[in-house]
Each structure stands twice: as C-alpha cells, then as structure tokens.
C-alpha cells in the first residue's frame, strides 16, 4: 500500500488547468461581490503585459486581511518564478497610479481569459 | 473610478490633420483592447478603428482605411487617433472607448469635437 500510495498521489498540475482555477476563483469572486472588495482598498496598476502574474501577485500582496482574495494570492504565488512580499515595487508598475481591488481583479479575469483562450498557460 | 478622457479635437480644414489622445484610468489600460468611435451630426453611431491590447492587431472602418492610424503607449495608459486627409464627412464628435466583447467591461469617454470645414 505504501508504495501504490506513490501513484495514487497527484503529481504537478498541468499550467492549464491551473490558470483555468484561478480563472474560476477569480469569477467567483466578482460574482459574489457585494460589498465593497476589500473595503475599496486600493493597489497598483500595471501598464505592461509582460511578467504580468508576479506584478499582479506585487499589487494584490499589499492588501491584508481581506480572505475573499487570499487564495487569489496564493494561486498566483504558483505561477511567479520568485519569492514576492508586500513592499516590493516591479517596473511593471504603474508610479502613483492605483485602482480599487474591485477593478484589478475584473480586469485580471478578463486579461487571463484571454491568454487562456490563446494557449498561453504560463 | 474608470476614466477616458479623449484630447485633440477642433477645426480643421479638408485635407488637414488632427492627432485625438485619449488619457485612460481606473483601470488596467495594457489589458484591454481599444477603439475610437464616432458620431456624425444626425447620424448613428459608427466604429472607425480598434487595436489590440498587445497593439499587434488593428482595425478600421472602409470610410478611414489608409488616412486614420490607431495606436497605444501602455506605458503612458493612452490611445491615439492619427487622422490624416480629412474629409468634411469626417466631422464627428469622435469617442475612445474599450473594445471588449465580455460583458460588463464597456467603457466610453466623453467626447471630443471634430469639425472639418473650409
């Protein structure tokens, strides 16, 4: 049993399938939004496309104590290369420019459906 | 909130040139494809041009083709409307707006005033 327990355990999951969670958490999110996402907090905007999952992870890792986005972080954790924590500043960011949580997570969902629908799973 | 705030428009004469900026935020402009619009004097309205998020793909009505171009600086959240040999049919009050087909990610400007005359 104890060897057979090595097959039955999941191996990695496929980039897919991954970005598809993380498309599914992120409707279930704006679909269940009622209040306020995180009491209207707000995080840096991104102006570039490129390293888009570890500047997005950048932006969203500054609010804390808001779980409707806690696995939102983690997910996204997944598909950054390197270690991200709150403080950090890419040069994907936009200077002075932030936008409400809200608005951040609707326009990730849309930007990742896209890559999705082209292939690009990573 | 979101914000598009179209720039440039004015008189001008036939054959003349206008460059219309659109100033885009709230949101997150590099991830949205984009287009101008524009509403003649009486008439509906009608898109004259889209480009991709990425800028690698555009788009234009017959009626500009070869003397409007469409462009975008992420970096700087703006659109552009380079318009080239203008008509008096041209005269419009011409509108920047994001080009989604999803629902819910529609957002329009206001406006800016295009007149083409002698």
């Known amino acids: 049993l104890t060897c057979l327990g090595g097959f039955a355990s999941p191996g990695p999951v496929p980039p897919s399938t991954a970005l598809r969670e993380l498309i599914e958490e992120l409707v279930n999110i704006t679909q269940n939004q009622k209040a306020p996402l995180c009491n209207g907090s707000m995080v840096w905007s991104i102006n570039l496309t490129a390293g888009m999952y570890c500047a997005a992870l950048e932006s969203l890792i500054n609010v804390s104590g808001c779980s409707a986005i806690e696995k939102t972080q983690r997910m996204l954790s997944g598909f950054c290369p390197h270690k991200v924590s709150a403080g950090q500043f890419s040069s994907l960011h936009v200077r002075d420019t932030k936008i409400e949580v809200a608005q951040f997570v609707k326009d990730l969902l849309l930007h990742l459906k896209k890559l999705f629908r082209e292939g690009q799973f990573n | 909130g979101v914000q598009l705030l179209e720039s440039g428009g004015g008189l001008v004469q036939p054959g003349g040139s206008l460059r219309l900026s659109c100033a885009a935020s709230?949101?997150?402009?590099?991830?949205?494809?984009m287009g101008w619009a524009r509403q003649a004097p009486g008439k509906g309205l009608e898109w004259v041009s889209r480009i991709t998020h990425h800028g690698n793909v555009t788009y234009y009505a017959d009626s500009v083709k070869g003397r409007f171009t469409i462009s975008r600086d992420n970096s700087k959240n703006t659109l552009y409307l380079q318009m080239n040999s203008l008509r008096a049919e041209d005269t419009a009050v011409y509108y920047c707006?994001?080009?989604?087909?999803?629902?819910?990610?529609?957002?329009w400007g206001q406006g800016t005033l295009v007149t083409v005359s002698s």
């Open positions: 709230g949101f997150i402009f590099a991830w949205y494809d």
């Open positions: 707006a994001t080009a989604e087909d999803e629902p819910g990610y529609d957002y």
